[in-house]
């Protein structure tokens, strides 16, 4: 058993351009806190997977208010270490996630709001009992500087905290086959292995394979609290014969609350008030819970489906991640069909469809002429998703409902005069021009640039355009 310790040295803007804006403002003061999550081995595990080695939350840092116009400095940090106790052997190789959280202290209904500022992750090799290791990690424009170490809790020693040490029985040397415990040369290695299942909290052994109980506990594995039912007094150390308690210390003696929990006596036994980041009857369960407010962007927090996951954030559409902290670029999935333009409005996804297509995802190809009649003998033409009418002579407009003024567009060139006719228009050309639209000049020698005019028409006569 032992403790992984993390010391945050600084959190602030990283080097280079693009310094981040301060996360706090005069209108919205805030403070930082940190969360560390440890997993055994060097696997590239997702942030969502359980913190199998343990997790811890720091205290809240001092309240910080940005000075207007000043760049974001290194932000004030919480006091103290983050400590993650581990019960079994230290694995030697581990993965870590360190999250920097901001607690906004504005006038929030229902308490303060939390948001994730930065998350760094890494994989490291580390021997227990070694010196502090220093590290720098960057997340976007932010930089986190920290140190960490793993140390064994007595009587465990060694790079994995699996060897046990105990004081020498003789001043000069250790017993047969036992080595001195480096670096504690005045102690000897203890090859004791207690009975399998012996309670690590309430049992101990002086001979291999035995399980001796601490006061107040009984049973072959020291997991059974001593009964008080047949005793006169409700507390005290056990009598070896009766298993009864005689007057003595109370249920909070020795503080049964782990991880800095405070103990208070109750009529039935005791109660632990746990620090943030721990819960359970003895504050023995580490990790963030729904009470810590881990979900963002409208995510709702419910309990995890298994004991290892203390919470699950159910994210609304548009967000994902274990804390609903990641905005989904829903347009990257190209949901709009037939060339529609995708718009992610945050609360909804919209497709702006090209002409001739409709539906939430532009999936419907419109039959443009269906149910559409072109008036006055016009015919409907489909094309490019847009409906169009080809109108009979003398009619125009989208549905051929408008009587056309064929002269409105001034169709006669070179000063020719336009006359409306029941079947179209007639251009009366100015001298020197001819053609249906008076578009051709008459040559000076009297020959036209076109083949000869039809019989009965002289150049300069009005030409009817059919």
């Amino acid at each position: 058993a032992g403790v992984f310790e993390l010391q945050i040295h600084s959190f602030g803007p990283g080097p280079g351009p693009g310094a981040p804006r301060s996360p706090c403002s005069a209108r919205l003061p805030c403070r930082l806190f940190f969360r560390v999550c440890l997993k055994p081995g060097l696997s590239e595990e997702a942030a969502e997977s359980p913190c199998a080695l343990g997790a811890a939350l720091s205290a809240r840092g001092p309240v910080y208010t940005e000075q207007p116009g000043a760049p974001a400095p290194d932000l004030p940090l919480p006091d103290g270490l983050l400590q993650v106790p581990f019960r079994d052997a230290w694995p030697g190789t581990f993965s870590f996630i360190i999250e920097t959280w901001r607690e906004e202290l504005g006038d929030q209904i229902g308490g303060p709001a939390w948001s994730l500022l930065a998350r760094v992750a890494g994989r490291r090799r580390l021997a227990a009992g070694g010196p502090w290791a220093r590290d720098i990690q960057r997340a976007g424009a932010w930089e986190l500087r920290f140190s960490y170490r793993a140390r064994c809790e007595p009587p465990a020693v060694g790079t994995a905290c699996t060897r046990l040490c105990r004081p020498r029985s003789a001043p000069s040397r250790c017993g047969p086959g036992l080595r001195p415990c480096a670096p504690l040369e005045d102690e000897c290695e203890a090859p004791l292995v207690c009975r399998a299942g012996c309670s690590p909290e309430h049992g101990f052994c002086e001979q291999p394979g035995e399980c001796r109980c601490l006061e107040g506990w009984t049973g072959p594995l020291c997991t059974v609290p001593v009964s008080t039912s047949s005793c006169l007094s409700p507390r005290g150390p056990s009598s070896a014969t009766t298993g009864c308690l005689v007057p003595g210390p109370g249920p909070c003696d020795g503080n049964p609350c782990a991880n800095g929990g405070s103990c208070s006596e109750t009529p039935r036994s005791f109660e632990c008030t746990c620090p943030r980041g721990f819960y359970g009857l003895r504050c023995e369960v580490s990790g963030v819970t729904c009470a810590d407010g881990p979900c963002f962007n409208g995510g709702l927090c419910v309990g995890g489906a298994d004991p290892d996951s203390a919470y699950i954030c159910h994210c609304p559409p548009g967000f994902q991640g274990s804390n609903c902290e990641k905005r989904v670029d829903r347009c990257s999935l190209q949901p709009c069909r037939n060339g529609g333009l995708c718009l992610d409005l945050g609360h909804a996804l919209r497709c702006r469809c090209r002409a001739g297509f409709a539906g939430p995802r532009c999936e419907h190809d419109l039959d443009d002429c269906a149910g559409r009649a072109c008036a006055n003998g016009g015919t409907c033409v489909e094309g490019g998703g847009a409906h169009r009418c080809s109108c009979a002579l003398g009619f125009g407009g989208r549905d051929c409902r408008e009587r056309a003024d064929p002269c409105a567009a001034r169709p006669c060139a070179h000063g020719g005069r336009c006359y409306a006719h029941f079947s179209g228009l007639v251009c009366a050309c100015a001298p020197g021009y001819m053609g249906a639209r008076c578009e051709f000049p008459v040559h000076p020698d009297g020959a036209s640039a076109l083949p000869a005019a039809p019989p009965g028409l002289r150049p300069g006569d009005p030409q009817r355009y059919l």
Epitope: G110, T289, G298, G299, L300
Partner: antibody, heavy 121, light 107 residues
């Protein structure tokens, strides 16, 4: 201050539908889930479902899936619950409540006064 | 569905008494347990969230404790305005459920 306004009472006939309203004020309507809770006379509270105004997403109690339909109108900051195929079992007081939502807190911090629905021919 | 059992059903007390109301869950709800007070002909009011977190505007005489399946709402020195029905509610899993309530009445 936060307020959720509900009409006092609705008298409806068996087999018909009724649409209950819940008008919110005093906070950002689109940022907080709204939940609906049923309370029959002299009895406990039953959760019906929640709706997130910004997206219209819902969580539903299976028991009420074919009974209650939750909607919102963000322009008027109003949440609605339509109850269909009404029977005498649906006679109850229906509360809307605001969910804290900040940090994911699934807790009802402000409640409407409730609408009393009576189903009678 | 998680069933929340509240006891006692009715508690008769005199102003000034200190009382404890119990809420027991049919399976662990971790610390996702909240308490509400409902007075006659009124809507419920949030008292305590997440087992022991206080709510602004709620008197400090109300406190909560417990973990897993057993929870307690304590009222230190009951006042006349405290009479009504108290409900516990879990948000550990869907569907959200409430206890049947404990009625705190004047002795």
């Amino acid at each position: 201050q936060v307020q959720l306004q509900q009409p006092g009472a609705e008298l409806v006939k068996p087999g018909t539908s009724v649409k209950l309203s819940c008008k919110a004020s005093g906070y950002t309507f689109t940022s907080h889930w709204i939940t609906w809770v049923k309370q029959r006379p002299g009895q406990g509270l039953e959760w019906i479902g929640d709706i997130y105004p910004i997206s219209g997403s819902t969580n539903n109690n299976e028991k009420f899936r074919n009974k209650a339909t939750l909607t919102v109108d963000t322009s008027s900051s109003t949440a609605y619950m339509q109850l269909s195929s009404l029977t005498s079992e649906d006679s109850a007081v229906y509360f809307c409540a605001k969910i804290i939502t900040v940090g994911g807190a699934y807790v009802m911090d402000y409640w409407g006064q409730g609408t009393s629905v009576t189903v009678s021919s | 569905d998680i069933v929340l059992t509240q006891s006692p059903v009715t508690l008769s007390v005199t102003p000034g008494d200190s009382v404890s109301l119990s809420c027991r869950a049919s399976q662990s709800v971790r610390n996702n347990l909240h308490w509400y007070q409902q007075k006659s002909h009124e809507s419920p009011r949030l008292l305590i969230k997440y087992v022991s977190q206080s709510i602004s505007g709620i008197p400090s005489r109300f406190s909560g404790s417990g973990s897993g399946t057993d929870f307690t709402l304590s009222i230190n020195s009951v006042e006349t305005e405290d009479f009504g029905v108290y409900f516990c509610q879990q948000s550990n899993s869907w569907p959200l459920t409430f206890g049947a309530g404990t009625k705190l009445e004047l002795k």
